[in-house]
Amino acid sequence: DSSKWVFEHPETLYAWEGACVWIPCTYRALDGDLESFILFHNPEYNKNTSKFDGTRLYESTKDGKVPSEQKRVQFLGDKNKNCTLSIHPVHLNDSGQLGLRMESKTEKWMERIHLNVSERPFPPHIQLPPEIQESQEVTLTCLLNFSCYGYPIQLQWLLEGVPMRQAAVTSTSLTIKSVFTRSELKFSPQWSHHGKIVTCQLQDADGKFLSNDTVQLNVKHTPKLEIKVTPSDAIVREGDSVTMTCEVSSSNPEYTTVSWLKDGTSLKKQNTFTLNLREVTKDQSGKYCCQVSNDVGPGRSEEVFLQVQYAPEPSTVQILHSPAVEGSQVEFLCMSLANPLPTNYTWYHNGKEMQGRTEEKVHIPKILPWHAGTYSCVAENILGTGQRGPGAELDVQYPPKKVTTVIQNPMPIREGDTVTLSCNYNSSNPSVTRYEWKPHGAWEEPSLGVLKIQNVGWDNTTIACAACNSWCSWASPVALNVQYAPRDVRVRKIKPLSEIHSGNSVSLQCDFSSSHPKEVQFFWEKNGRLLGKESQLNFDSISPEDAGSYSCWVNNSIGQTASKAWTLEVLYAPRRLRVSMSPGDQVMEGKSATLTCESDANPPVSHYTWFDWNNQSLPYHSQKLRLEPVKVQHSGAYWCQGTNSVGKGRSPLSTLTVYYSPETIGRR
C-alpha cells in the first residue's frame, strides 16, 4: 500500500563547491520503525539485475553502520519520523539526485531529492516592489536559496557601493517547506536615489565577498524645480519690471504641464517657464512659485517673495479690547499697509498728539475713566507719511461710584412704622439697570432705587443697597435704629432653686430680652393688686396664703409689656386636721357610722393612720373609717394622722357615742 509512506522535504536544494547542504526531511512509515537506510547518489534501477546502480554515499543497516563517506555525509534522522541529512563540505560532483533508500519491516522505499551544486557561490536575487515612489517606504528583499548550519553567511546592502545606514532584518529558513536566507531592508527613497545602484552582497562569516546582485533604482518622483528672479532680491518699487524663470532639475517620468502660482493661487495664461511682470503694482506683492506636473503629481519650486514698495496707506486703529474695564490693560495697534514697514508712528487722543508715543503699539497697563475717547494714528516709512484715519473709540466701563443708602423717614423710627429708603450713586458706565438690598425681605420697590418697608420690625437693624450695571457696588449699611416696647417679659424664680416650702425665703425676677430705648420701669401684681415696682419681688418667709398667680410689667417710652401669669405654689405639711362623723357623733347600735379625716395639705395627704382612745393604731389607712354594723363597744374618742412628702399632722380627739337600740333595751 503505497500510501503508507509520507515524505516532506524541499524538492531541490542549492549549494556551491566547498559549502554545505542541510536537507530538512520528515517521513512516516506506518508499519513500523526504519530497519535500514542507504543514501544513493544518482540511483538508477537496472531491470535486468533488479538492482539499483549508483554511488552509495551513506549506509546504515540493522546490522550496524557501514562507513563510506561517513564524516562528510551524515544521516541526522531517526527510525520513525526524521530523515534530515547533512553533506559538509559539498562538492560540484554532488549535483544530481539523492536517493534515500529506506526499509521497514514490510516495505522498501526510494525517495528522491534534487541537489544543485554550482562551481562558485551563486548570486542572491533582489526583489523590488513593482513601483517605487519618493518618500514612500518600500521593502527591498534579497533572497538566496541557501542556508546551512555548518556554513554561516551574511547578506549586506550597498547603495552606490556604500553600506546602507538602514537596519536590515535577516531571516533564515531551514524547514521541510523551504530553505533560504533572506534580508529585508525598509527604505524611504528620495528623488535623488533615482538611477542609483543598489547591491545585495553575499559574504561569508568573515565578510569575504562571495557573490552579489545589483539593481538600478527607478524612483518615481514629482518634478524638482529651481526658480530664478531678476532682480535677485525681489524687492522693487511700483512701476518696475520683474522676470522669474523656472528650471527643471529632475523629473521621473517626464513632466507634462507648467504653471505659476501667486500666494497659492494659479495665475491664468502663464504656462511657460518664464514669468514676466511689467510695471508692477503693490497688489502684485506676494509669494510666487512655479508648478510642474508629471504622472506622479505636481512639483513646486521654493517660493520667491516679491516685495513691491509703497508709502503707508491711511491708518486704522485696533483696540484690544473695547469696551475696557477700569483697571484692566489696553493695547492700541496702528494698522497701515506699507512696504517697507513703517518706522515711525504719531498717536492722537481726542485729536491731541500723545507725547512720546512713536511705536506701532501703545500699551496702557491700568485704564482709568478719563482714558476714554477717540484714538487715531499716522504711519511713516522711507517712502513717505500716510494719512490719519478715522480713529477708534475707547469706552471705559466701571462699576457705580459713591453709592449711599439714605433713610427718607423722620427719626426715630418706631416698630410698625413704614420706612422708605433710597439708593443713590455718583456716576456709572454703563448705566445702572438694577438695585439690590441686604438683607432680603418681602419689601416693596415702588420705583427703581427706592425701598419701602411696611410695618418695620423691631429687629430690622441695618439696611444696605447696591447699584448695579455689569457690576454691583454696595453702599455702607445704615442703621434703622428701630425703637420698640420691651420684649419677651417673663417671671423667673431666683430662689429657692428647688420647690417652695412654707417658711422659705423666695425671690422672683422680672426678666425681658431687649428694649429700645433701654430706660424701663417694672410693676408686679397679684390678682390685679399692685405689689411692687422693682425688678425683683421678695418674700422673707413664704406662707401657703402667698400662693397664687403673679404677673410683672415692663414699660419704656414706646409701650409696656406684661409677662404671662406665673403660678406660685407653696408646699406644706398636713394642717387643720379634724375627724368628722356621719351621720353624727351619736349613732344607734347596728347602724353604720363613717369617720372622715379632713385636712389642708400641699401636696395632698398620701397616707392616713387612725387611732382609738387608747392611742392604739387601727388597721385602716384610708381617709374614711367605716364602722358597720356599729356596736356599743365602738363608743369612744378617735383621732387621725395625715402624711405627705413634706411632713405629718394630727387631729384632736373626736368622741363617737353608740347607744343601745330599743330591741336591746327591750330584751334587757
Epitope: D1, S2, W5, Y45, K47, S50, K51, F52, E103, T106, E107, K108, W109, M110, E111, R112
Partner: nanobody, 128 residues
Framework: QVQLVESGGGLVQPGGSLRLSCTVS????????MGWFRQAPGKEREVVSC????????YYPDSVKGRFTISRDNAKKTVYLQMNALKPEDTAIYYC?????????????????????WGQGTQVTVSS
Amino acid sequence: QVQLVESGGGLVQPGGSLRLSCTVSGFSLDYYVMGWFRQAPGKEREVVSCISSSDGATYYPDSVKGRFTISRDNAKKTVYLQMNALKPEDTAIYYCAVDKPFYDGGSYYTCPVDFGSWGQGTQVTVSS
C-alpha cells in the same frame, strides 16, 4: 529464518518444456514479490520473471517474453515458472527469490530488488 526450496529443473532438449516450482517458508508478510533469476557460468545474474502477491502483476524481460509464464498460489506461498520453447541459451542455474515490495516514490517494482532472500537454485540444461 526465510527458506526457499526450488524444484523441477533438469535436462531438456531444445524446444522442450519444464515447470519449476518454489515454496517459501518462514516469511510472514502478506504482501511480497517473488521472482526467478538465473546465472550462467561467467555471466551476471539476470531476471527471468517476477510476480506480485498483492495484484498478480508480472514482469518478463524481452529474452523470455512469450515463452515463459509465471504464476502463484498465495495460500501455499508457492510460485511456478512454466518454461516452453527452451533454447540452449536458457541453460543456467535458476534461483527463486522473495522480498518486501519496493516503492520508488509511490510506484513499486514487481521484482525483488537486491534479492532480499533466495534459494539454493535448480539446474536447467537445454541441450540436444
